[in-house]
């Protein structure tokens, strides 16, 4: 109500106002992954549940074909957790055999795709060497940060190995974004 | 101010407005845990500091008896970090003894309790196998995401083993939520 | 529009309104660290990129000399991820040599400095023992939480060992804050 006579003296409004409940928001949860093609040197993207259980999309934030679609420009907080699980990594097997022990790793990347730009942009990466002693291991990688996004941008979550993703519970592996 | 003549043309307001400083918020920090009963198959809940040091609750977000009480419906960002610490896990001892090496684990769950619903809902889980080589280990598990909550919902943090929680510093183990 | 006759009956505004786009915000990304002096018992602070690539500061949130400067009082969400990388930790070498195996560790601290207060305040700490089997290890530590800050407060990120910080990619190591 900037510059209006009837605004009370303490009113600090410098730009168009928005009701918070009207902002684009999404929380997506893990589903069992169906095998899909991906480019050789690119990590595969996860697909997600967008409405069942704890998952939701609202206020024009839509999900389709592994992508969250950004409906309006602004600053968004984006987050994801991926829980990985596996058997003993090669690293420890190699170690037992006395060979050089290059560690295995697990990686999560939150990627932005802009149609007008040829290359995807990696916004966030969490990467961890896995060199476990135990025969069965499991662990999460969490990411979250704020980014300036444009209307039409698309967000996805890529992982180093889809077969290691724990898809059993909606609280273990998830992906979300909200306009600040 | 949707549809009101005196709203300037750029005004984008679609719902009742809220001043951000008036929103329910809390940041709770770790305290030494007193032993309490918990059901056999349920992880014990942590209790928290709500006002000393870095901790606070405001705008009707109250803390009582291990629970954060949600004072109004809406979308909340909820987060927690729990730092665990321990001695060499059984896993590595078992491994040295040549027995099957089922890994130990550490787990944090942020749980929602709704009085009208008999079962608690697990909102977020971070779980990690612990199979450490060193005799003393320590590590954090961080969780954070957005959820649609209802007035009267209660939030708590459950852990797999209270005795492993590092309660020594308010910056190591904490729990918070804020209305978006 | 608290107390104004022309506010519609559903209007819930209890304090001065702020347009969200006008709020102080910053997302800083890693740069190669130049060696700098730091006090013997204090972890060194990282310096950051504030405008290139994904990094930005806006709405009077400024970055200078390793510090984010808080331009107005309020509740802020603050976050950081630091990715560490290293060679086999001493811990496993010591263990092989049969000596007591005090683990190495990696630590991130988000610290608040208030000019009127002599001691910095540790807001958030993520600390992890590193006792890796593999010869090359890497892993992130993520932190994020909400704090009440005052105009003039300064935020920095301290780490246990600057030489272990992965500065190669802006998506691996970052630091941000935004007014809620």
């Amino acid at each position: 109500l900037k510059g209006q006579e009837f605004a009370p003296s303490h009113q600090q409004v410098y730009a168009p106002l928005r009701a918070d409940g009207d902002k684009p928001r999404a929380h997506l949860t893990v589903v069992r992954q169906t095998p899909t093609q991906h480019f050789k040197n690119q990590f595969p993207a996860l697909h997600w549940e967008h409405e069942l259980g704890l998952a939701f999309t609202k206020n024009r934030m839509n999900y389709t074909n592994k992508f969250l679609l950004i409906p309006e420009s602004g600053d968004y907080f984006i987050y994801s957790q991926v829980t990985f699980r596996g058997m003993t990594s090669e690293c420890s097997e190699i170690r037992q055999a006395g060979r050089p022990n290059k560690p295995d790793s697990i990686t999560v990347v939150i990627t932005k795709v802009t149609d007008s730009y040829p290359e995807p942009t990696q916004l966030l990466m969490g990467t961890k060497s896995v060199c476990e002693v135990g025969s069965n291991w499991f662990q999460p990688i969490y990411l979250g940060a704020m980014f300036s996004l444009q209307e039409g941008d698309k967000l996805m979550v890529n992982v180093s190995d889809i077969s290691l993703v724990d898809y059993t519970k909606e609280d273990k592996t998830f992906f979300g974004a909200f306009l600040l | 101010l949707k549809g009101q003549e005196f709203a300037p043309s750029h005004q984008q307001v679609y719902a009742p407005l809220r001043a951000d400083g008036d929103k329910p918020r809390a940041h709770l920090t770790v305290v030494r845990q007193t032993p309490t009963q918990h059901f056999k198959n349920q992880f014990p809940a942590l209790h928290w500091e709500h006002e000393l040091g870095l901790a606070f609750t405001k705008n009707r977000m109250n803390y009582t008896n291990k629970f954060l009480l949600i004072p109004e419906s809406g979308d909340y960002f909820i987060y927690s970090q729990v730092t665990f610490r321990g001695m060499t896990s059984e896993c590595s001892e078992i491994r040295q003894a040549g027995r099957p090496n089922k890994p130990d684990s550490i787990t944090v769950v942020i749980t929602k309790v709704t009085d009208s619903y008999p079962e608690p809902t697990q909102l977020l889980m971070g779980t990690k196998s612990v199979c450490e080589v060193g005799s003393n280990w320590f590590q954090p598990i961080y969780l954070g995401a957005m959820f649609s909550l209802q007035e009267g919902d209660k939030l708590m943090v459950n852990v797999s083993d209270i005795s492993l929680v590092d309660y020594t510093k308010e910056d190591k183990t904490f729990f918070g939520a804020f209305l978006l | 529009l608290k107390g104004q006759e022309f506010a519609p009956s559903h209007q819930q505004v209890y304090a001065p309104l702020r347009a969200d786009g006008d709020k102080p915000r910053a997302h800083l990304t890693v740069v190669r660290q130049t060696p700098t002096q730091h006090f013997k018992n204090q972890f060194p602070a990282l310096h950051w990129e504030h405008e290139l690539g994904l990094a930005f500061t806006k709405n009077r949130m400024n970055y200078t000399n390793k510090f984010l400067l808080i331009p107005e009082s309020g509740d802020y969400f603050i976050y950081s991820q630091v990715t560490f990388r290293g060679m086999t930790s001493e811990c496993s070498e010591i263990r092989q040599a049969g000596r007591p195996n005090k683990p190495d560790s990696i630590t991130v601290v988000i610290t608040k400095v208030t000019d009127s207060y002599p001691e910095p305040t540790q807001l958030l700490m993520g600390t992890k023992s590193v006792c890796e089997v593999g010869s090359n290890w890497f892993q992130p530590i993520y932190l994020g939480a909400m704090f009440s800050l005052q105009e003039g407060d300064k935020l920095m990120v301290n780490v246990s060992d600057i030489s272990l910080v992965d500065y190669t990619k802006e998506d691996k190591t970052f630091f941000g804050a935004f007014l809620l």
Epitope: T29, V31, R32, Q33, T34, H47, W48, E49, H50, E51, L52, G53, L54, N62, Y63, T64, N65, K66, L69, Y167, T168, K169, E170, D171 | E119, T121, Q122 | -
Partner: antibody, heavy 123, light 107 residues
Framework: QVQLQQSGPGLVKPSQTLSLTCAIS??????????WNWIRQSPSRGLEWLGR?????????DYAVSVKSRITINPDTSKNQFSLQLNSVTPEDTAVYYC?????????????WGQGTLVTVSS | DIQMTQSPSSLSASVGDRVTITCRAS??????LNWYQQKPGKAPKLLIY???SLQSGIPSRFSGSGSGTDFTLTISSLQPEDFATYFC?????????FGQGTKLEIK
């Protein structure tokens, strides 16, 4: 191969309760990769989704607004089946009732379907 | 709730014809649109999922296209066994909803 087998009476009196069961083979009612649905079809309403039961971190149920006050869908993990109860039926509830699995793995669709049960509400 | 509208409601065609059925959603369902075929006395049978993916075992003469609110099912060359009723269905949001059907009859 997943199969669904429906059972239940074909005639129900007005004001009484319609009860149908759907037995699952080749999948589990407690799977977190599927939802278990009831759908009906009548000339006047076409295909109408009634509701579903499914597990994620816990059991969930969702119901169509048109029947929400009268419907219950319950899973039975011990028998690997799920049931439909529709209370206070009227002749407008006369329809062919189908159970169907909806696969939840990114894409989602109803497949397979039960064989269908024609339920007539009449005194 | 999302309403699904199919057109035409009925259609007469001959064996070998190319046939197109359209489906419109009242709001975007992104690509979450499925097509089913139903024959008298039988349950619906899945043909196409996520707008354009052919269910295994379904002949390649069936194809689907579209995204957002407008979708089409095309049968490139009608066969005698294709005379049936076809339904679109959105699986983007709850409650799930179906089109009213298109009855494909022999001319």
């Amino acid at each position: 191969q997943v199969q669904l087998q429906q059972s239940g009476p074909g005639l129900v009196k007005p004001s009484q309760t319609l009860s149908l069961t759907c037995a699952i083979s080749g999948d589990s009612v407690s799977s977190n990769s599927a939802t278990w649905n009831w759908i009906r079809q009548s000339p006047s309403r076409g295909l109408e989704w009634l509701g579903r039961t499914y597990y994620r971190s816990k059991l969930y149920n969702d119901y169509a607004v048109s029947v929400k006050s009268r419907i219950t869908i319950n899973p039975d993990t011990s028998k690997n089946q799920f049931s439909l109860q529709l209370n206070s039926v009227t002749p407008e509830d006369t329809a062919v009732y189908y159970c169907a699995r909806e696969v939840v793995a990114g894409p989602r669709w109803f497949d397979p379907w039960g064989q269908g049960t024609l339920v007539t509400v009449s005194s | 709730d999302i309403q699904m509208t199919q057109s035409p409601s009925s259609l007469s065609a001959s064996v070998g014809d190319r046939v197109t059925i359209t489906c419109r959603a009242s709001q975007s369902v992104t690509s979450y649109l499925n097509w089913y075929q139903q024959k008298p006395g039988k349950a619906p049978k899945l043909l196409i999922y996520t707008a354009s993916s052919l269910q295994s075992g379904i002949p390649s003469r069936f194809s689907g296209s579209g995204s957002g609110t407008d979708f089409t099912l095309t049968i490139s060359s009608l066969q005698p066994e294709d005379f049936a009723t076809y339904f679109c269905q959105q699986s983007y949001s709850t409650p799930r909803s179906f089109g009213q059907g298109t009855k494909l009859e022999i001319k």
